[in-house]
């Protein structure tokens, strides 16, 4: 048997119990709310900071690319890959055919001002894509040179030069004084590479990584 | 932490909270039911009030289905 | 719907479920306590057993802190 309690005490006990239980409920709900708020607000802030980052990234590129053409990568709405508007895209890169005639060094500088390099061709598929946009009666500088004239060809972006993935015209390269490479069309062999003097003005092809925002 | 990761972590927390509370609620509900039956047997319905009130609570839960 | 959007919807559902269940649990807890008191008054402690059992449940809940 429990000793008898006064009704007043019992009422007081019940009141305290109710207070404890509802306090616990309030605390639990507050914790839930905090969780839920964090789950809603943090992603919102995350999205906001992501948007801010994107805008600053875009502003960074806007200096030389006033407009970008973007496509959604995969299913996620978050990931967009962009190329500057007049540029063409292939795989993870953007390409620009410069029709101004400039020396090799000036062409490379011109590309780098746009955040790119003279084109580095890594595969036959890439070359096949590029030549679709070229004129047969023109020559275009590639990002390939041999400044020492010792036949140590090097790509502008430091990609290792792989003899097995080259598309020289037959008999090329053929002159130690011709230290820069172009891509041009020869009726006998179609499109291929040739070595020429670096100071001679030619058209050029710029290549840059796609801009991911 | 990335944005989706955070969401999944909070999902897990809310899910666990839901499970724990559901278990506690069911346990308490069963205790109340048992108590009501015991009370009825012992005092021939002295505690009909409790039984009724318990029944009301049961009705409420029946109508308020937890989300699937 | 994208994967993250789905996660937020699930968050909302679990959140609401958590709140509803918290309220129901607290309501039931208080009902049980009130019933115990009423029972005590009516039968001079015939239902001490119920009271004790309720107390145990209270102890359990006290120790089992809800996840932070």
């Amino acid at each position: 048997m429990v000793p008898e309690e006064e009704p007043q005490d019992r009422e007081k006990g019940l009141w305290w119990f109710q207070l404890k239980v509802w306090s616990m409920a309030v605390v639990s709900i507050l914790l839930l709310s905090v969780c839920f708020t964090v789950s809603s607000v943090v992603p919102h802030n995350f999205m906001y900071s992501k948007t801010v980052k994107r805008l600053s990234k875009l502003r960074e590129y806007q200096q030389y690319h006033p407009s970008l053409t973007c496509v959604m990568e995969g299913k996620d709405i978050e990931d967009w890959s962009c190329c500057p508007t007049p540029w063409t895209s292939f795989q993870s890169s953007c390409y620009f055919i410069s029709t101004g005639m400039q020396s090799w060094t000036k062409s490379q500088k011109n590309c780098s001002v746009m955040g790119a390099d003279l084109v580095v061709i890594n595969t036959r598929e890439e070359q096949d894509f590029i030549i679709q946009n070229l004129k047969r009666n023109s020559s275009y500088f590639l990002g390939l040179s041999d400044p020492g004239g010792r036949r140590h060809w090097q790509w502008v972006d430091q990609t290792p030069y792989n003899e097995n993935v080259t598309f020289w015209h037959s008999g090329e390269p053929n002159n130690l004084d011709e230290r820069c490479a172009i891509i041009n069309f020869r009726s006998s062999e179609e499109w291929g590479w040739n070595d020429i003097h670096c100071h001679v003005p030619q058209k050029s092809i710029c290549k840059m990584k796609k801009i991911y925002i | 932490l990335g944005e989706p990761q955070l969401c999944y972590i909070l999902d897990a927390i809310l899910f666990l909270y839901g499970i724990v509370l559901t278990l506690l609620y069911c346990r308490l509900k069963i205790q109340v039911r048992k108590a009501a039956i015991t009370s009825y047997e012992k005092s021939d319905g002295v505690y009909t009030g409790l039984s009724t009130r318990n029944q009301e609570t049961y009705e409420t839960l029946k109508h308020e289905k937890p989300p699937q | 719907l994208g994967e993250p959007q789905l996660c937020y919807i699930l968050d909302a559902i679990l959140f609401l479920y958590g709140i509803v269940l918290t309220l129901l649990y607290c309501r039931l807890k208080i009902q049980v306590r009130k019933a115990a008191i009423t029972s005590y008054e009516k039968s001079d402690g015939v239902y001490t057993g119920l009271s004790t059992r309720n107390q145990e449940t209270y102890e359990t809940l006290k120790h089992e802190k809800p996840p932070q």
């Epitope: 400039q102 020396s103 090799w104 060094t105 000036k106 490379q108 500088k109 040179s145 400044p147 020492g148 004239g149 053929n174 002159n175 130690l176 004084d177 011709e178 230290r179 820069c180 020429i196 003097h197 670096c198 100071h199 001679v200 003005p201 | - | -």
Partner: antibody, heavy 121, light 111 residues
Framework: EVQMVESGGDLVKPGDSLKLSCAAS????????MSWVRQTPDKRLEWVAT????????YYPDSVKGRFTISRDNAKNTLYLQMSSLKSEDTALYYC??????????????WGQGTTLTVSS | DIVLTQSPASLAVSLGQRATISCRAS??????????MHWYQQKPGQPPKLLIY???NLESGVPARFSGSGSETDFTLNIHPVEEEDAAAYFC?????????FGGGTKLEIK
Amino acid sequence: EVQMVESGGDLVKPGDSLKLSCAASGFTFRSYGMSWVRQTPDKRLEWVATISSGDSYTYYPDSVKGRFTISRDNAKNTLYLQMSSLKSEDTALYYCARQIYYDYAYYFDFWGQGTTLTVSS
Amino acid sequence: DIVLTQSPASLAVSLGQRATISCRASESVSFRTSHLMHWYQQKPGQPPKLLIYGASNLESGVPARFSGSGSETDFTLNIHPVEEEDAAAYFCQQSIEDPPTFGGGTKLEIK
């Protein structure tokens, strides 16, 4: 010893034509790009034409393009400059120079003694 | 075309002193580590003679008192100590792109 001797300079009238020659010796002529550079009466140096070692390319500044033609005869170790539609501003001392490529550019490491062209009515 | 501006147009330097000739290009004549400016000396009645190529490389047979420096658009030819036989005109030249161009020349006199 590297030697280059220019010849063919003369006094001509505006509109006339003239051919300059440069006989090279003391080096493997066919292996080098060659240029013509002129020095005007006010002592300014001005590039006139270039021919590549393989005879595959010829380059000219706009001021002479279409009027001057550079050529070479590797068998005779001789460089030529055919000039037509001559103007008074073509009056200068004409040097032939051997080109040496350095990185992406070139310089002239040997020069001939020069031959004088005067265009005057 | 790239315009090369030499300064001063003429200078007189005492024997044994330092002569400094400057050449400024209208645009960069450097590419990465390559500085494509060259210097020539021309004595009266003679053709130009190569002194320095690639901004700072001394041509073989040229005395070590000649030195060159610079990058991008600003280049300098130094002669120290100046000797009697250094009285001549000095020209800078670039050929990073066509047409290759020359500076207007600097006439050095020995006092």
